[in-house]
Amino acid sequence: LKGQEFAPSHQQVYAPLRADGDKPRAHLTVVRQTPTQHLKNQFPALHWEHELGLAFTKNRMNYTNKFLLIPESGDYFVYSQVTFRGMTSECSEIRQAGRPNKPDSITVVITKVTDSYPEPTQLLMGTKSVCEVGSNWFQPIYLGAMFSLQEGDKLMVNVSDISLVDYTKEDKTFFGAFLL
């Protein structure tokens, strides 16, 4: 029959591509920290700005009580940078001679909390040594990777010493995630 020569021999069904603008995403920025109690075996979690300046949460991604809440299951890119600053940090041997309050390392951990699992999971961890004699120091630690996350998962950023976090600029210390 006429016209049949143009008919495809098989039909392919394509799922409509999801617009990037519809996907959950958030970028949180540093804010002044308030001293809070934290668990004995866990570094304190940072509090974040979710709405002012460069910060935002979109498409059901929510921030509450130091946690970024994952609204749907999928593969997410999760990232954080924490910039630390401090006064001169003496090296280990000097520290051992009676200055135990000076850190010789700084650590950032991105942690996942799942309600159905009792223990928080460390997703990413970064550590740097700070041993700069004779100067004040600044050290950024950047972490970022892709993870398969489930709806209801909660993400937070923990640091070894909240008092050393540089909260003066929103482009120095930040935390975010977006659905790929």
């Epitope: 804010v31 002044r32 308030t34 509090h47 700005e49 979710h50 709405e51 002012l52 300046g53 460069l54 509450t64 009580n65 909260y167 003066t168 600029k169 929103e170």
Partner: antibody
């Protein structure tokens, strides 16, 4: 101790532009969010908008078409311009500081009354 | 915009009384709720931030509670200097919005 001080004319004619400046002393204007808030006589407080030290602004949609907030970090000042004013814009205008969403407006200027009248 | 509703709009009480003021948000604001005190002719003063955190320098007789949409400010024992107007304010989203105030008067 951080202090905020509003300055500008107390009387503005209808259809003209209201201009106010807030001078910040005792601390840096950097790393904070700086807002303008107004209170018509005997009425509720109304947030006008904020500016960040980087120059980023966000305005109340109800006033957005008439508002401009700017900042001069070298002078530790930020300013408000409200165009096409009417009698409804008569209010005490406050400048205020916000450290972040979590912390509220922790420092305020003493306020300046601006009357719109011919 | 998030609407903030305060009640009561005015309240008479005596020195030493325990007083509670309530504030309701038109949608959940988690704990992004602040309380201010304003005396006549003065600027508002921050009392409580993040629903329950006492601002530095504020007497401990002031306390706040609540989360989501319903919040309260409590003054445990009224002092003469507490007679003023109190405002709640949400800082969950912009535009920032305030309640219209509760005027606390001497009985």
């Amino acid at each position: 101790q951080v202090q905020l001080q509003e300055s500008g004319p107390g009387l503005v004619k209808p259809s003209e532009t209201l201009s106010l400046t807030c001078t910040v002393s005792g601390g840096s204007i950097s790393s904070y969010f700086w807002s303008w808030i107004r209170q018509p006589p005997g009425k509720c407080l109304e947030w006008i908008g904020y500016i960040y030290y980087s120059g980023q602004t966000k305005y109340n949609p109800s006033l957005k078409s008439r508002v401009t907030i700017s900042i001069d970090t070298s002078k530790n000042q930020f300013s408000l311009k409200l165009s096409s004013v009417t009698a409804a814009d008569t209010a005490v205008y406050y400048c205020a500081r916000e450290t972040g969403s979590y912390y509220g407006f922790d420092y305020w200027g003493q306020g300046t009354l601006v009357t719109v009248s011919s | 915009d998030i609407q903030m509703t305060q009640s009561p709009s005015s309240l008479s009480a005596s020195v030493g009384d325990r007083v509670t003021i309530t504030c309701r948000a038109s949608q959940s604001i988690n704990n992004y709720l602040n309380w201010y005190q304003q005396r006549p002719g003065k600027a508002p003063k921050l009392l409580i931030y993040a629903a329950s955190s006492l601002q530095s320098g504020v007497p401990s007789r002031f306390s706040g509670s609540g989360s989501g949409t319903d919040f309260t400010l409590t003054i445990s024992s009224l002092q003469p200097e507490d007679f003023a107007t109190y405002y709640c304010q949400q800082s969950y989203s912009t535009p920032r919005t305030f309640g219209c105030g509760t005027k606390l008067e001497i009985k």
